[in-house]
Amino acid sequence: AKTTPPSVYPLAPGSAAQTNSMVTLGCLVKGYFPEPVTVTWNSGSLSSGVHTFPAVLQSDLYTLSSSVTVPSSPRPSETVTCNVAHPASSTKVDKKIVPRDCGCKPCICTVPEVSSVFIFPPKPKDVLTITLTPKVTCVVVDISKDDPEVQFSWFVDDVEVHTAQTQPREEQFNSTFRSVSELPIMHQDWLNGKEFKCRVNSAAFPAPIEKTISKTKGRPKAPQVYTIPPPKEQMAKDKVSLTCMITDFFPEDITVEWQWNGQPAENYKNTQPIMNTNGSYFVYSKLNVQKSNWEAGNTFTCSVLHEGLHNHHTEKSLSHSPGLQLDETCAEAQDGELDGLWTTITIFISLFLLSVCYSAAVTLFKVKWIFSSVVELKQTLVPEYKNMIGQAP
């Protein structure tokens, strides 16, 4: 973010805020970057009763406020000025703050509190399971007790639909009300990327509020699923953790569940999907089981629902295989065994080579003997051949 000077606003109360012959004045320092700013009152001559609050970062810009409490009666002879300095932008601002005359009637300025509207996607499991009904949900919060009822309108790809179920508004702990409307949708409409719009209207709103949602755009990528047995260090405890690692999937909508011998397991927790550097996501799921259940050889299955998968589903099972577990003590013992094994292999190779050499020597000796015998035989026969050639007509 680039260097941005602050805007400074004086904060003066109405007479209703003036109590015990004291008045609190304030200064709002808004929209600056980077930190810090310094706030003084009357160039530092006012220091008691000063509170400067920590800065808050919002949308890459900082905002802070400072207040000073001064006597209101008799009126201070001097005006109260807040002095703001922002070194990074070489900005200095002085704002005079004039407390209102205590005799005036309180000025009541009521800014209409507009309710907030939020739209939520369907649960991934509902979208991918035929016997469940996916629903898009629209929630209106901060409705005042005196506000009239809100009306919901729903649109699928800008075509109005009338199948939503709107619940009666519910009172919240802070005495505001909340209103919820749910639109049951077709599985394929969500998967095909249709847009769902919720329009909320009320006499209390200056204008209707609209919120739109659809499936994350982009090519679905199937997750890789790996199961990880409990670490050996955990085997000293009564409970052990089985882990399911689900990686490289897109979009982030995913359901991860566990089964134990074919029945749903309850005692598991999933992380929220976390984005990889390449834009895909990964999730970990941890199932806690009694060590005795693990050691008994029960089968635990990590079940994953994601639109990128064939059948939108895959699962990986995990069970305790004592013969295949190799812990460090065993590995250390194995190191010793490997030393012995190398000795055995060396002796075996030496003996093998010796036997090959011996066989080769014997074979060569025999071949040489046979060869010399044949040569001798040939020499005794050749003269006779010559004689016969010579006798030819």
Epitope: V127, T129, I130, Q188, L191, L309, N311, H313, T314
Partner: nanobody, 124 residues
């Protein structure tokens, strides 16, 4: 060749019962979850019920819970949908679909095989 053939549909009065069958051939039913779907006139196809490959897990859409029962007989390579207390809104073409896996889910996509459907009409 792989086939799923639905049968048992017909005209029935409201409150009546029907049993649909999904006969499979060309593959071993033991390894497949089976889902029943229906499509009402002018509407999209929707899931009705699901049974896992072992038969150990069954699921129903809310609108048919307590009225429909899904079951399977792997020896006969057949899956059944017993439909009681039928309502006019149950009218439609009923399809079965097969998913190759042992999970307890019938999902909204990725079916391996589909049948051609059987018509159920609930009317007085």
């Amino acid at each position: 060749q792989v086939q799923l053939v639905e049968s048992g549909g017909g005209l029935v009065q409201p409150g009546g019962s029907l049993t649909l069958s999904c006969a499979t051939s060309g593959f071993s039913l033991d390894y497949y979850s089976i889902g029943w779907f229906r499509q009402a006139p002018g509407k999209e196809r929707e899931g009705v019920s699901c049974i896992s490959s072992t038969g150990g897990s069954t699921n129903y859409v809310d609108s048919v819970k307590g009225r429909f029962t899904i079951s399977r007989d792997n020896a006969k390579n057949t899956v059944y949908l017993q439909m009681n207390s039928l309502k006019p809104e149950d009218t439609g073409v009923y399809y079965c679909a097969a998913y190759r896996r042992s999970g307890a889910y019938c999902t909204s996509g990725g079916q391996d095989y589909w049948g051609k459907g059987t018509l159920v009409t609930v009317s007085s």
